[in-house]
């Protein structure tokens, strides 16, 4: 596809045609309730075709859904926000000019969300090592439909002991999600000391349940750099 739009020569009359079938390959859209859905039918033709939308074979009108829908003609797209079960069905774009007509149908299924305890992505947070004075970042990727509460916790010592009289470990909450906490899924540690070494726990809870995963921080003396390639990144799977 050309990087930018070029008006067709007015002499080259042409029936509508698809300009980007890649964006039309996914015909079945299973979308969680309350999400946004977007259907696209990028097309060309001369004169420039018009686009209209049908739902289950009938003209799709704004009043057919609460909140209506958005059509961006320049992007050949239909957008529905905050989908609900009644939005389920077949959506057909009809693209036409005086020389012809083409159409493409999408099927929308709206999946009702069933509440579950938080799910944490496997492998995160990941073990890390750095030298004294270095910076490090732990990332915890959370999947939760219900509002999750994220806590970063570290085992600490009190009076030289890791455990209290009740046999439970001493824990310190380093960061938690809330009004004053930006991006609670990331715990950044700056200018670390040897005392920062140890286990870091990402604990996430919602009203259904909780989950936690942990990672270890190894702090090396300044002269002994970590044995890995020089790379700065946020873990991505």
């Amino acid at each position: 596809m050309a990087e930018d739009f070029v008006s067709e020569n007015s002499n080259n009359k042409r029936a509508p045609y698809w300009t980007n079938t890649e964006k039309m390959e996914k015909r079945l859209h299973a979308v969680p309730a309350a999400n946004t859905v977007k259907f696209r039918c990028p097309a060309g033709g001369n004169p420039m075709p018009t686009m209209r939308w049908l739902k289950n074979g009938k003209e799709f009108k704004q009043e057919h859904r609460i909140g209506g829908y958005k059509v961006r003609n320049q992007h050949w797209s239909l957008i529905m926000e905050s989908v609900v079960p009644s939005d389920k069905g077949n959506y057909t774009c009809v693209v036409e000019n005086e020389y012809g007509s083409i159409n493409h149908t999408y099927h929308l299924d709206v999946v009702e969300r069933s509440p579950h305890r938080p799910i944490l992505q496997a492998g995160l947070p990941a073990n890390a090592s750095t030298v004294v004075g270095g910076d490090v970042e732990f990332v915890c990727k959370v999947y939760s439909d219900a509002q999750p509460h994220i806590q970063w916790i570290k085992h600490v010592e009190k009076n030289g002991s890791k455990y209290g009289p009740d046999g439970l470990p001493y824990l310190k909450v380093l960061k938690h999600s809330g009004i004053n906490s930006s991006n609670a899924e990331v715990l950044a540690l700056f200018n670390v000391t040897e005392a920062d070494a140890g286990e870091y726990i990402c604990k996430v809870s919602n009203y259904i349940g909780q989950a936690n995963q942990s990672a270890w921080l190894t702090v090396l003396p300044k002269q002994q750099a970590p044995g890995r390639e020089k790379e700065h990144h946020h873990h991505h799977h």
Partner: antibody, heavy 119, light 107 residues
Framework: QVQLLESGGGLVQPGGSLRLSCAAS????????MSWVRQAPGKGLEWVSV????????HYADSVKGRFTISRDNSKNTLYLQMNSLRAEDTAVYYC????????????WGQGTLVTVSS | DIQMTQSPSSLSASVGDRVTITCRAS??????LNWYQQKPGKAPKLLIY???NLQSGVPSRFSGSGSGTDFTLTISSLQPEDFAVYYC?????????FGQGTKVEIK
Amino acid sequence: QVQLLESGGGLVQPGGSLRLSCAASGFTFSDYAMSWVRQAPGKGLEWVSVIEGDGSYTHYADSVKGRFTISRDNSKNTLYLQMNSLRAEDTAVYYCAREKTYSSAFDYWGQGTLVTVSS
Amino acid sequence: DIQMTQSPSSLSASVGDRVTITCRASQDISSDLNWYQQKPGKAPKLLIYDASNLQSGVPSRFSGSGSGTDFTLTISSLQPEDFAVYYCQQHYSPSHTFGQGTKVEIK
């Protein structure tokens, strides 16, 4: 070459109004959707509003809905943002930006105009 | 609205480093994601559009990948002129929300 030049920024009192303009040149203005994006001092980018090339479609960020109006005059190659009921939190540099065709990526930006809302 | 979360919020790196910034959407946004670079006092500059397409004139050391909810911007070998703030932006929903930005600083 493509050029976008914003104007109309300045100091305004809370509750006041201001109209920003963006003069476009170097491309067929009516072929492109245009957006306004703002950036409060020391903060990140916030998309404000969009208008389709022929003016048939507009949309606004929730934070400005009902207070700001985007429009365009294709005969003058100019984009506008009418800002009413201004608040302190509207203080920002306002950029106009051109959307790439078939995508909502902003491929050309103006230099920005500063709007300060303060009593 | 669709929320965009960038990680990390800042990072320190050296010239020649490989740098990766990630962006996560609160719902599936297909490949409707763009990346921008912004230097102090300047307007943002488009680097990558639709998740993986390099904008004309942008050096090939910049690349983008991902689809659905997870996206990555990679700078294969950081150059002095690359120290800046990077933003992702989704254009799947009508409100084209940006991520909060990632500041790439000199180590």
